[in-house]
Interface confidence: low
């Protein structure tokens, strides 16, 4: 037991020593971003730091180094013929970014970008649901709600709820890869 | 890799239906919010209809022009979505788009409608 | 309905030139979340619409930064900086702020 939970504490350690030494000043400054905006500032800041590229060529200069595939399970990555990482069944990554690494690095995606907008999104809807490219990716999608832990829901919905009502910078946002 | 596949367009009399269907591939196909749009020579694109998810039940939309006749529905457990077109009109000839949230589009599937 | 009266329908460039692609609403396609839902995609012969820009000025993944969009409320613009023969299509701009969502009439971006 003992070796498994510090086997896993290993991967965790190795997960985060992926996150950039260095956040540009930016990433500091206030954004305020609900629903889908929400979700668009995510990934942006989440894959650049997964793919360290900039994300849909916006604004990230975050960089990682590559041997990400090394402290992945071999399960996640369940598409062979795709050069992006399988990052599927990573609890707590949003259903986009889930969604995104289908495609390859080299397009970062269609699902990633936000066209469409539902102009009702209300505080309890957002708490279950957010919405991308006119494609609606719930928060972590209804269906598969239940098998994250609550905490982690919940701070995922807090965030959310902060970032719509009083902002969030792109750096707290970074601590939630 | 995104695929969506229209099929079902064809020749049909005015006053006759057809239905149109969309296969989807490489995306979360029960998360997405599905349309149909439409181009002709007369028209340009029109926005034909529009389905959300399972999320948001299954809520439909459509263009003033084809209410009442045509009717939107999908299969989540098939990724497919549909578009059931009845009293068709000779103004509802054209390409045939099915989108995924306007981000993804299909090749298209021509739909004549002539006597 | 949103009317968008997209300007001009044709547009003969050279290679290398500046162009410049007009779209107007007929009401504001702001929201009342402060944002402006409208694309801009291209069309190539016998291809499918690819999206170009989302959200007025959101250029999509792959999209190089020759390609450039701006404007607010109801009146927009596409730019493109040194048009490639890559460039070359119909564009159209598409507005999915309200229901039904309506589209521009096309730009054909040719040759001279």
């Known amino acids: 037991m003992l070796r498994w939970f510090l086997s896993h504490l290993l991967g965790v350690w190795l997960l985060l020593s992926q996150l950039p030494r260095e956040i540009p000043a930016t990433d500091d400054k206030k954004l305020k971003a609900c629903g889908r905006d929400y979700v668009r500032l995510q990934i942006e800041v989440c894959g650049s730091i997964w793919w360290g590229r900039k994300a849909g060529q916006l604004r990230e200069r975050r960089q990682i180094s590559e041997p990400l595939a090394e402290v992945v399970p071999s399960s996640i990555i369940n598409d062979p013929e795709i050069l992006s990482l399988m990052l599927q069944s990573i609890p707590g990554m949003p259903q986009e970014l889930r969604i995104a690494t289908r495609s390859g690095k080299e397009k970062l995606l269609r699902e990633l970008h936000f066209v469409l907008e539902d102009s009702n999104l209300n505080l309890e809807e957002m708490k279950k649901t957010f919405l991308n490219t006119q494609f609606e990716a719930e928060d972590k999608s209804l269906s598969k709600l239940d098998k994250h832990p609550r905490k982690k829901r919940d701070n995922y919905i807090k965030m959310s709820d902060k970032c719509c009502n009083v902002g969030c910078t792109r750096r707290e946002l970074a601590s939630r890869c | 890799e995104v695929k969506l596949e229209e099929s079902g367009g064809g020749l049909v009399q005015p006053g006759g239906s057809m239905k149109l269907s969309c296969a989807a591939s490489g995306f979360t196909f029960s998360d997405a919010w599905m349309d149909w749009v439409r181009r002709s020579p007369e028209k340009g694109l029109e926005w034909i209809a529009e389905?959300?998810?399972?999320?948001?039940?299954?809520?439909?939309y459509y263009a003033e022009s084809v209410k009442g006749r045509f009717t939107i529905s999908r299969d989540d457990s098939k990724s497919s979505v549909y578009l059931q077109m009845n009293s068709l009109r000779t103004e509802d000839s054209g390409i045939y788009y099915c989108?995924?949230?306007?981000?993804?589009w299909g090749q298209g599937t021509l739909v004549t409608v002539s006597a | 309905d949103a009317v968008m009266t997209q300007n001009p329908l044709s547009l003969p460039v050279s290679l290398g030139d500046q162009a410049s692609i007009s779209c107007r609403s007929s009401q504001s396609l702001e929201k009342s979340n402060g944002n402006t839902y409208l694309n801009w995609y291209l069309q190539k012969p016998g291809q499918s619409p690819q999206l170009l820009i989302y959200r007025v000025s959101n250029r999509f993944s792959g999209v190089p930064d020759r390609i450039s969009g701006g404007g607010s409320g109801t009146d927009f613009t596409l730019k493109i900086s040194r048009v490639e023969a890559e460039d070359l299509g119909v564009y159209f701009c598409v507005q999915v702020s309200h229901v039904p969502f309506t589209f521009g009439s096309g730009t054909k971006l040719e040759i001279k």
């Open positions: 989108t995924g949230g306007f981000a993804y």
């Open positions: 389905i959300r998810s399972k999320a948001k039940n299954h809520i439909t």
